[in-house]
Amino acid sequence: GITNINCSGHIWVEPATIFKMGMNISIYCQAAIKNCQPRKLHFYKNGIKERFQITRINKTTARLWYKNFLEPHASMYCTAECPKHFQETLICGKDISSGYPPDIPDEVTCVIYEYSGNMTCTWNAGKLTYIDTKYVVHVKSLETEEEQQYLTSSYINISTDSLQGGKKYLVWVQAANALGMEESKQLQIHLDDIVIPSAAVISRAETINATVPKTIIYWDSQTTIEKVSCEMRYKATTNQTWNVKEFDTNFTYVQQSEFYLEPNIKYVFQVRCQETGKRYWQPWSSPFFHKTPETVPQVTSKAFQHDTWNSGLTVASISTGHLTSDNRGD
């Protein structure tokens, strides 16, 4: 950066090199050039010469003032106009940054994705800080009182092998940057309660010719968890509203779910599961598209032959076996 240049003087920032976005700041430049009583001192920001708000303080020093500085990063340097020198002489440079102190991390969540061998902890970091912000994840065993700390810039994967202090833990997150530090509330977890089953995947669909044609969706998961509850949501691609069906599932065999759908319409299906009675759901599976036939012939759609688009984490709460609509969309 600009800070690696050889200086013939000194440049500094008040209140600090890293400061709160929107503040008024002063950048000072002090020349120390042999045989030069500077006629003028010039400031440059990102290579652009500044014209206004420059005040000469004394023979060797000038100040550049910025009101309501909003740029996350800027490279500043200053130069001197020396008598009998044709070109400006470089004095010094400095990289400056503006941003915000971190918000209190909230929505701390820790889950174990089946087969991952990790506990993944995430949180809502709040508003963008614009400056380097680090997070320390504290994991404290409620059985042994032993505490471990993990430094990260975003989320963290903690090997389950390193969680040797039993099953119950307190987890909290500390956020810190040059402008401040905040700490989340403590989350109490039990390792057995935070496992998310292996992803459920829709493999194919077929519409069977009958008096009333029906569509069968084939789906499966590699989970070894015995009691799994799943939801399948579906809608015509032209609709905003999802229909949601709930299932208590045993994945010892491929699941088949029947739907009575309108003819000649493109539908989209997604599935997600959780260990029955537990808190965390899988994210919705990739969208699976199936177009129902106009008339009677059998139509099959296979997985991985569909368009892809980002799925959300829409939630539906219904009674087992009950068909509902979820108006929240994606």
């Epitope: 006629r39 003028k40 010469k49 014209r51 206004f52 420059i54 000469r56 004394n58 008598p83």
Partner: antibody, heavy 119, light 107 residues
Amino acid sequence: EVKLVESGGGLEQPKGSLKLSCTVSGFDFNSAGMSWVRQAPGKGLDLVADINSKSYNYATYYADSVKDRFTISRDDSQSMVYLEMDNLKTEDTALYYCTVHHSDYFEYWGQGVMVTVSS
Amino acid sequence: DIQMTQSPASLSASLGETVSIECLASEDIYNNLAWYQQKPGKSPQLLIYHASSLQDGVPSRFSGSGSGTQYSLKINSLESEDAATYFCLQDSEYPPTFGGGTKLELK
């Protein structure tokens, strides 16, 4: 030879508008700052508006008395500088000079163009 | 903005005399001062910049001096063509500001 030629002056009523132009030749226009300096009859010199070169990101300055009424602009490809004057007042009556600065002092001046604001 | 006070407002002198015009800045301007000559019906011409540097083509009877807040323009051996109004300009801090002018008449 450095030449600055102003045009566009004349008689205008209060609240009226005029656009002054300045054609420049004889030096590297792109690296120079351009200003309009005015001189009311029998009075001193006042900087009205200034537009800097690309190295200053074309930063502009206006005297408080003309802020929000006057607009300075430049066309580097044509070596031209302009001063659009709206909502003219009688106190804007003056001889308007187009000037060049490489440092901050005004090195070269045009012959001036008269602007008279009167009802 | 930096204020420039020029004195005298007018002066009358004879051919061959030496005259001085003063400019006082409201704060130290670190030799960032220029002097201009304006003849009746003409545009100003740069005489001196950086307080003491003579612009090309300007006769050597013109000289500038000073430091800090006080600066002066000296004209030696006045000639008839020197009858004009003289202005100082500070360009130490933005915006540049002019002195009020000194009208020099020849007797």
